[in-house]
């Protein structure tokens, strides 16, 4: 999912894929967002380091697990790429940096009256990427009011220096504010000349054009189609530039298509993603994962939700299919484009929509009006610890939620097993979003042992906690991984971002939901909660959550599921859905088992014979 938090005084160790100079952490984050492999970044402001070469350093990083170890570094700022962050994805950066000179190739100098005028000139110059402006108080009189338009090979400054009375910034072309205007036409059977700045493989000219638009130095392109005479050059997209900013010549050439970058378009820029799916085409690349899904759209959605996935191929070969599901190959490459494009295959291919700034609506495949009380649909991999506890008697049905806390351990509510203590009737499904996706062939875990808290009594609300030991350990994936547990007796942390998830009823007299629902609910003090439940004892081993006005809550079928809170960028299992008076009633918060109060019990029960805890706890 989308992770927007920044970590101050922290630096990610390892995982470097690129480095550059940027004036601040936000610009560094934007470069990370648009880099095909960057998931994390670390930025060193001038104040954070004495080494002049590393000042303003922006370090782009990748990680197979999606995270890297953080080391303390005073002044450093780290964070995540905004891939998957929908409308927050933008290459537009309006800030002006005072007292900073962003260095590059100075190709144009003029006198202007203000920094805004200088930025406007840069925005209206086809080759300008960034600029520096010497103010009226600059120490050298002859340079005062000078506006220097600049570019560099990578589109970022080649160096950044602290310099009084100088102001710098970036072109606003990515904000669709250029006065230049753009050429929307594409030209069939025409090849442009000039300098090639990059070469990528694309399935069509429109993808080639979008890549050109977001490449820092591409002004125009030529695409060689899949029937181009030289086989090794088919589907090659050549990104080009020239001194003048326009092609110096063009040559009629069968089976080529040429056009221009759309970065200078005034009203709107194309989205930085490619939504078209290409039937009969295979995209080659490094294998990230292979999963069975029903349909090419679900394959694209799966790729989009797996943040490292750049493109995919959905195979319809008989040997790659089981019933209605076929293999979805999730892939990546160094430049974000396929390393091979093959035609006439039994596959369909396309790209991740992780950079689409319209957000999830472009990949939404299931629309439903019935939801967990006041909740909304979750998306793939959003709550990878959520499991569905199902009972198979004559029919099979979802009864409770649970949380994966280790390879072989699930934490849930004790009351889920009231009247059903037999482990053989239970099936545990992990890594799922839609209950309707479960077929007779869907893998599930069986229970090796049910450990109900020794002080739990049926029909009482106390000690409503149980551990499930699975018969076989689960592998962790993007869609199936554990939730961290809180520290023992965690009472000092103030949690402000808490969510309850589950497939439970959408109203008191409702039905189990198909899509995993999520609801953001504030925690309520135990004192406040006790006032609302005067007939019950709200103990310190319980935590309450809900809105005074009601309307949002867990409900039947959510029991045993997680109440998770995000603190300092990390999700923790704060509560287990336990009980409440009805669902989402006014002034009747939900009551949850407080996990922190049971840490000793959890650790004791999950200790293996070698004495190591078998669940996830925060470092």
């Amino acid at each position: 999912g989308c992770l927007t938090q920044l970590y101050e005084n922290a630096f990610f160790r390892g995982g470097d894929v690129a480095s550059m100079y940027t004036p601040n952490a936000q610009y560094c984050q934007m470069r990370c967002t648009f880099h095909p492999r960057c998931l994390l970044f670390s930025f060193l402001p001038a104040s954070s380091i004495n080494d002049m070469e590393k000042r303003f350093g922006c370090f782009l990083k990748d990680s197979v697990t999606g995270t890297l170890p953080k080391v303390h570094r005073t002044g450093a700022v780290s964070g995540h790429s905004l891939k998957q962050c929908g409308h927050q994805i933008s290459a537009c950066h309006r800030d002006i940096y005072k007292g900073v000179d962003m260095r590059g190739v100075n190709f144009n100098v003029s006198k202007v009256s203000s920094v805004e005028e200088c930025q406007k000139r840069c925005t209206s110059n086809i080759r300008c990427q960034f600029f520096s402006y010497a103010t009226q108080t600059f120490h050298k009189a002859e340079y005062r009011n000078n506006c220097l338009l600049k570019y560099s090979p990578g589109g970022t400054p080649t160096a950044i220096k602290v310099l009084s009375n100088v102001e710098s910034g970036f072109s606003l072309k990515p904000c669709a504010l250029s006065e230049i205007g753009c050429h929307m036409n594409i030209f069939q059977h025409l090849a442009f000349s000039d300098v090639d700045v990059a070469r990528v493989l694309t399935p069509d000219a429109f993808v080639c054009r979008t890549i050109c638009t977001y490449h820092p130095n591409c002004l125009f392109f030529t695409f060689y189609t899949n029937v181009w005479k030289i086989e090794s050059q088919r589907n090659v997209c050549l990104l080009k530039t020239s001194e003048s900013g326009t092609p110096s010549s063009s040559t009629p050439q069968e089976n080529t298509i040429s056009g221009y970058s759309l970065l200078t378009c005034k009203r709107t820029l194309p989205e930085p993603c490619h939504s078209k799916i290409y039937p009969g085409v295979d995209f080659g690349g490094e294998e990230l994962n292979v999963t069975f899904v029903k349909g090419v759209n679900v394959c694209q959605e799966t790729c989009t939700k797996m943040i490292r996935c750049q493109f995919f191929t959905y195979s319809l070969l008989p040997e790659d299919c089981k019933e209605e599901k076929c293999k979805c190959f999730l892939r990546l490459s160094m430049d974000g484009s396929p390393t091979r494009i093959a035609y006439g295959t039994q596959g369909s291919s396309g790209y991740s929509l992780r950079l689409c700034n319209t957000g999830d609506n472009s990949v939404c495949t299931t629309k439903t009006s019935t939801r967990i009380v006041g909740g909304t649909n979750s998306s793939w991999g959003e709550w990878p610890w959520q499991v569905s506890l199902q009972v198979k008697l004559t029919a099979q049905r979802h009864l409770c939620g649970g949380s994966l806390i280790g390879h072989q351990w699930v934490l849930t509510a004790a009351h889920c097993f009231d009247g059903l203590p037999l482990q053989d009737v239970w099936r545990i499904y992990s890594g799922i979003l839609n209950l309707s996706d479960i077929t007779k062939d869907t893998p599930f875990s069986q229970i090796k042992e049910i450990i109900i808290h020794q002080n739990y009594k049926v029909s009482e609300g106390n000690h409503d906690i149980a551990l499930i030991k699975l018969q076989a350990p689960l592998n962790y994936t993007e869609f199936q991984k554990p939730i961290c547990l809180p520290s023992k007796g965690d009472t000092s942390t103030i949690y402000t971002n808490c969510w309850v998830t589950g497939w439970g009823f959408s109203k008191e007299k409702g039905e189990i939901q198909n899509i995993l629902q999520k609801v953001n609910i504030p925690l309520v003090t135990n004192e406040e909660c006790q006032k609302r439940y005067q007939d019950y004892k709200i103990t310190q081993r319980m935590v309450c959550a809900g809105y005074k006005e009601g309307g949002k809550d867990a409900c039947k079928g959510d029991s045993g599921g997680p109440l998770v809170c995000k603190h300092n960028g990390m999700w923790r299992l704060v509560g287990i859905t336990s009980w409440g008076e009805g669902c989402a009633r006014r002034e009747q918060p939900g009551v949850y088992t407080k996990v922190a109060e049971y840490m000793d019990w959890i650790l004791e029960k999950t200790q293996s014979s070698d004495g190591k805890a078998q669940m996830q706890s925060p470092a």
């Epitope: 069509d204 078209k276 009969g280």
Partner: antibody
Framework: EVQLLESGGGLVQPGGSLRLSCAAS????????MLWVRQAPGKGLEWVSG????????AYADSVKGRFTISRDNSKNTLYLQMNSLRAEDTAVYYC?????????????WGQGTTVTVSS | DIQMTQSPSSLSASVGDRVSITCRAS??????LNWYQHKPGKAPTLLIY???SLQSGVPSRFSGSGSGTDFALTISSLQPEDFATYYC?????????FGQGTRVEIK
Amino acid sequence: EVQLLESGGGLVQPGGSLRLSCAASGFTFSQYKMLWVRQAPGKGLEWVSGIGPSGGLTAYADSVKGRFTISRDNSKNTLYLQMNSLRAEDTAVYYCARAPWFGELGMDVWGQGTTVTVSS
Amino acid sequence: DIQMTQSPSSLSASVGDRVSITCRASQSISTYLNWYQHKPGKAPTLLIYGAFSLQSGVPSRFSGSGSGTDFALTISSLQPEDFATYYCQQSHSTPPTFGQGTRVEIK
């Protein structure tokens, strides 16, 4: 001159069959995706079926799936549409069209059309 | 399937008029949008591909615009030979779908 010429239309009873042909000339037939598009009386254009340059990849509108079969013979520069189990609602002018590459740049050459009438 | 909705369904105009036809897609199709002219008894002809690009041999009075879900075909100065039915068509997803057509008649 680039040309497409349809043939094989006619009057047929419901449940009957017809085979339409489209002869291509003036271009490298094997490099193009080919399509059939129809227009029912008083209605708009409706895509019927498409086939990839090599003939391996085919697609059909839901309304004709299981009844119509598109094929091509690149050695004869000819596109075909085998229509079985014809219904009254299949009555239309059938056009064959070529689409460069994936068809993302539209259907740039069309035939004059052949009329299919399904009636008892 | 992606639905394409054209408006108006018909319009009356005089020679020399500036005419615009709009086309809306039920979901974003980027610039995978083409426009055709169709006259009775004739083969349709491609006017605009990729939302903006003029097909070879088509007069420059025809122009296309838009991206995402909203598109337009504009005839800057209507000529006698332009009276016909115009169709938009998306080439983003299979099946390729057409708008219902806009009939341009002489006033």
